[in-house]
């Protein structure tokens, strides 16, 4: 490849040749696939607005909890179980939550009037001993409420634990009460102010609108706008029972999801509200179901401070803000054009596929003999032919063969390693059709050439004399004008090639043969057709003409103009157009591959 | 849940020797802490072995340099090999097993019962003459 390029280079323009091919049903498939595939093409466009440049939203969101709930709780005083009666207030069982989300209490357990001192752990398993062995000074289980100090002391009768130092009474360890004491919370409300912003679209809105009557409660489907929710409903949106998960608290998503279209011609830019439950109620106890913490209240009782310990169980709601706004951008609907563009190609994908298919050697002597209906396709072979010319690699090993009693051509691909060319077996390829058109660029004297007298007699007599095999010729020759090589002995196998696969007469005997290759007026022709000022003298003619001979022989036999130039003449044939136009001294160099 | 099937016991002279073995059911039992117990007629159950998952090993005061705990996780089974065998040995020995999956059970709690969760039907070991 050249190193540098000029001027005319750059200013070029490369397109693909191409093959019309003229078939109702490759045309039906064509227009089937680019009908399917516009469609296509232009539905997605639509309906997810690939014209528009989409933006993800940013929000911000505020809630207020409202509801009054009556709890009665069961309290023991001196040994004695009372039912207390108590109203809670938003104060009281929401908790300020960072981010997007709410708290609202639906149960608890109380442990009252803790100080810090020592005392027996609760009960359990692991706090449990019968010996000081089983407590160890200053070890602090994860579990465990306190640090202990090793010493094994009674809890309640006969039951003995681990002393601790900690916030004592130790808190019990016992199951959340049921049913929940805040269950009607379930009658709470919540009112959810969101604002969003896209800032690329220079567009903000929020959910609550001027005109929005405020006493409303959300419905899926009677009220889908309104931003005021009742905490029943939306635990029974989720399938879920209020009531069940109150007593051991969960986490509920608020979902709110804007889809905006901000294009001015189809303007609509409102949220649409869904729930889903965000913890596994399907937890194993030992793995803490549902939704707790603990929060104590402080106070000092003859200058000890005391705390209140309240476990509190609750739905968490977190609000979950996404979605996108879009507006019409003419990039984003090029970019989309372009990136489609590629799918109209697939037509000629799959018509290319069914061609190549229809016309493997497969199809010709497994499908095509056996199944009738299956015959129309043989016609992709023909279609196959004009699509795809196929070319061997030019290894320094390649060699076209072509002998007079046969009909195909013979690729040899291999070293030939002492064997005669004739006798190596090589790939049959069909012979190329005979273009008839180039007959007519020779001279006249070849398509009507008046019998020169005695010529014929002489011609016959070759004839005669060719079928038996000489005494000299050499063994791999089957027409009994072959001479040996002169090559050296390494290349000489190359040379060792006969006209014929079989015995019989000579293709130098043919009246062809002398009209083609032979004659000095058509071979100067040919020459002069090249170049039409040529002067040849006496020595250079010859080699001109020999050559020229040689090329006339190998497209006549071979036709394709890449087999000839690695076709292998008989030797019979190269003798015999060395004998009429031969060197004056030295020897013949033989064939040299062209690449 | 882990069945638990103590097997090896039987009548054996003042210094002889036993091979207690527990098979153990479930497949998740790497994760027990393993212990051997004995309750002799009228006494309180004593702790006599333990073994934890990572392989830690407790004995009673009274075992100690005598018998010798190990564990066959691939087979599920706890021996307890017990050599110079003494008659105050003589009692029912119980295997017990503690749930190791959510946390391990501290070395100085291995001896302690109430840790146990699971307990099998015990087998007697007697030594006499």
């Known amino acids: 490849m050249p190193a540098c390029c000029s001027c005319s280079d750059v200013f070029q323009y490369e397109t693909n040749k191409v093959t019309r091919i003229q078939s109702m049903n490759y045309g039906t498939i064509k227009w089937f696939f680019h009908v399917i595939i516009f469609s296509y093409v232009c539905f997605a466009l639509v309906s997810d607005k690939l014209y528009q440049r989409k933006e993800p939203v940013i929000s911000s969101v505020h809630t207020k909890v409202k509801g009054i709930a009556e709890v009665k709780e069961e309290i023991v005083e001196n040994g004695v179980k009372k039912l207390v009666h108590s109203v809670f207030d938003t104060a009281d069982y929401t908790f300020p939550l960072q981010g997007n989300s709410f708290f609202v209490m639906t149960n608890f357990l109380k442990t009252e009037g803790q100080e810090q001192r020592l005392c027996p752990e609760y009960p359990t398993r692991r706090t449990l001993c019968s010996s000081d062995r089983g407590c160890k000074k200053g070890w602090m289980d994860p579990q465990s409420k306190g640090i202990q100090t090793g010493r094994c002391v009674v809890y309640e009768g006969n039951q003995k634990t681990c002393e601790v130092s900690a916030w004592c009474p130790i808190e019990a360890v016992e199951e959340a009460p049921r049913p929940a004491l805040l269950n009607s919370a379930e009658n709470f409300t919540v009112l959810i102010k969101n604002n969003i912003d896209f800032p690329g679209h220079n567009y903000t809105t929020r959910n609550i609108l001027p005109g929005l009557n405020i006493t409303c409660t959300f419905h899926k489907t009677q009220n889908p706008q309104c931003p005021i929710f009742r905490l029943g409903d939306i635990f029974r949106e989720t399938g879920d029972n209020f009531s069940d998960v109150a007593i051991q608290g969960g986490i509920m998503g608020i979902e709110i999801y804007w889809d905006c279209n901000l294009d001015r011609w189809f303007h609509h830019c409102r949220p649409k509200y869904s729930f889903r439950r965000l913890d596994d109620k399907t937890t194993n106890v030992s793995l803490y179901p549902g939704y707790n913490f603990r929060y104590a209240k402080y106070y000092k009782e003859n200058n000890v401070e005391k705390r209140t310990l309240i476990k509190v169980f609750g739905i968490r709601f977190d609000i979950l803000v996404f979605g996108t706004g879009g507006k019409f951008d003419i990039i984003q609907l090029v970019v989309y054009i372009g990136s489609t563009l590629s799918y109209f190609g697939l037509a000629a994908v799959f018509i290319d596929f069914l061609i190549d298919t229809y016309s493997s050697n497969c199809c010709r002597s497994h499908i095509y003999p056996w199944c009738k209906c299956c015959q129309p396709c043989v016609v992709n072979e023909y279609y196959y032919r004009k699509k795809c010319e196929s070319i061997v690699e030019p290894k320094p090993t390649l060699k076209y063969v072509s002998f007079v009693d046969e009909s195909h051509i013979r690729m040899v691909n291999q070293q030939l390693l002492g064997r005669s060319l004739q006798d190596v077996k090589g790939q049959e390829v069909p012979r190329p059709a005979m273009d008839f058109t180039d007959l007519s660029r020779l001279p006249l004297a070849l398509h009507d050439t008046p019998p020169i007298p005695g010529q014929p007699e002489e011609i016959q007599l070759l004839r005669k004399e060719a079928t038996p095999r000489s005494r000299d010729s050499p063994v791999w020759c089957q027409c009994g004008s072959c001479l040996p090589s002169q090559l050296p002995e390494s290349h000489r196998c190359l040379e060792e090639l006969c006209c014929r696969k079989k015995p019989g007469a000579c293709i130098t005997t043919s009246e062809l043969f002398r009209k083609l290759v032979l004659s000095r007026h058509v071979l100067q022709f040919l020459l002069l057709y090249q170049e039409p000022l040529l002067a040849l003298d006496v020595d250079s003619t010859n080699s001109r003409l020999r050559h020229c001979a040689y090329r006339c022989y190998a497209t006549w036999r071979f036709g394709s103009q890449d087999m000839a130039d690695f076709a292998i003449l008989p030797s019979c044939c190269r003798w015999r157009i060395r004998k009429e136009f031969p060197k004056s001294e030295g020897q013949y160099s033989g064939f040299k591959s062209p690449y | 849940e882990v069945q638990l099937v103590e097997s090896g016991g039987g009548v054996v002279q003042p210094g002889g020797s036993l091979r207690l073995s527990c098979a153990a059911s479930?497949?998740?039992?790497?994760?027990?802490?393993m212990g051997w117990f004995r309750q002799a007629p009228g006494k309180e159950r004593e702790f006599v072995a333990a073994?934890?998952?990572?392989?830690?090993?407790d004995y009673g005061d009274s075992v100690k340099g005598r018998f010798t705990i190990s564990r066959d996780d691939a087979k599920n089974t706890v021996p307890l090999q017990m050599n110079s065998l003494k008659p105050e040995d003589t009692a029912v020995y119980y295997c017990?097993?503690?749930?190791?999956?959510?946390?391990?059970?501290?070395?100085?709690?291995?001896?302690?019962?109430?840790?146990?969760?699971?307990w099998g039907q015990g087998t007697l070991v007697k030594v006499s003459s």
């Open positions: 017990a097993a503690a749930d190791e999956t959510l946390g391990a059970v501290p070395n100085f709690r291995l001896h302690e019962k109430y840790e146990y969760e699971y």
């Open positions: 479930g497949r998740t039992f790497r994760h027990y802490a």
């Open positions: 073994i934890s998952s990572y392989g830690s090993t």
